[in-house]
Amino acid sequence: TPEVWVQVQMEATELSSFTVHCGFLGPGSISLVTVSWGGPDGAGGTKLAVLHPELGTRQWAPARQARWETQSSISLALEDSGASSPFANTTFCCKFASFPEGSWESCGSLPPSSDPGLSAPPTPVPILRADHHHHHH
């Protein structure tokens, strides 16, 4: 079964900077990645970035830079402006779409005990409806 992992990392040198890393574990090619915060895509979450493997990336504040790391993983750098956007207590979600086969989404956050510079373990937090797009023709 395909799986999505999410890591949230606080930068050691700049405590206001965070990076979200997401990856897709499974067969098939990814056609679109959506990163949101505050909840899953379309369920209360606010989009931060969308990435297309050929057409490029789009991002919205407070996202600073979205990029592909591999064909199945992405990273998103964020700039925390302070109390107005407490990233340390925020859930980040990544949705990997493979049209028309399916889409898979998981969420993660910075562990409360994380030291700056240490990334969260890649423990997927699957969204229950993450496989609702499985199509078989």
């Epitope: 679109l32 895509d41 379309g42 989009k47 969308v50 057409l55 779409a97 049209f99």
Partner: nanobody, 121 residues
Framework: DVQLVESGGGSVQAGGSLRLSCVAS????????MGWFRQAPGKEHEGVAH???????RYVDSVKGRFTISQDHAKNTLYLQMNSLKPEDSATYYC???????????????WGQGTQVTVSS
């Protein structure tokens, strides 16, 4: 996620017409575009038509003048009126919502289960 349910597919003779419908529930305006893709067996999927958030319809060249995409916002429904159908239009048609990276393409973020269109000669 937004839920998309298509209907209106079926079998028709070449030259005939079909009207596809797509009802969107839990629709949000977080995406840029809404439209129709199709995929025939053994072929790559292609974007047939979509409507931008500004209401501008866009079509792939092969359907221009034959297909018309429209929306009924009150019913949260998207339509695709298909006239002068050809055998090469046979495919599974998917309703999609997605994001724009250029004028001509609506990259799917969510989609329905699809509805089958078969055009015989």
């Amino acid at each position: 996620d937004v839920q998309l349910v298509e209907s209106g597919g079926g079998s028709v003779q070449a030259g005939g017409s079909l009207r596809l419908s797509c009802v969107a529930s839990r629709y949000t305006s977080r995406t840029d575009c809404m439209g129709w893709f199709r995929q025939a067996p053994g072929k790559e999927h292609e974007g047939v038509a979509h409507i931008d958030s500004d209401g501008i319809p866009r079509y792939v060249d092969s359907v221009k003048g034959r297909f018309t995409i429209s929306q009924d916002h009150a019913k949260n429904t998207l339509y695709l009126q298909m006239n002068s159908l050809k055998p090469e239009d046979s495919a599974t048609y998917y309703c999609v919502v997605g994001f724009k990276f250029d004028d001509d393409y609506c990259a799917p973020n969510d989609w329905g289960q699809g509805t089958q269109v078969t055009v015989s000669s």
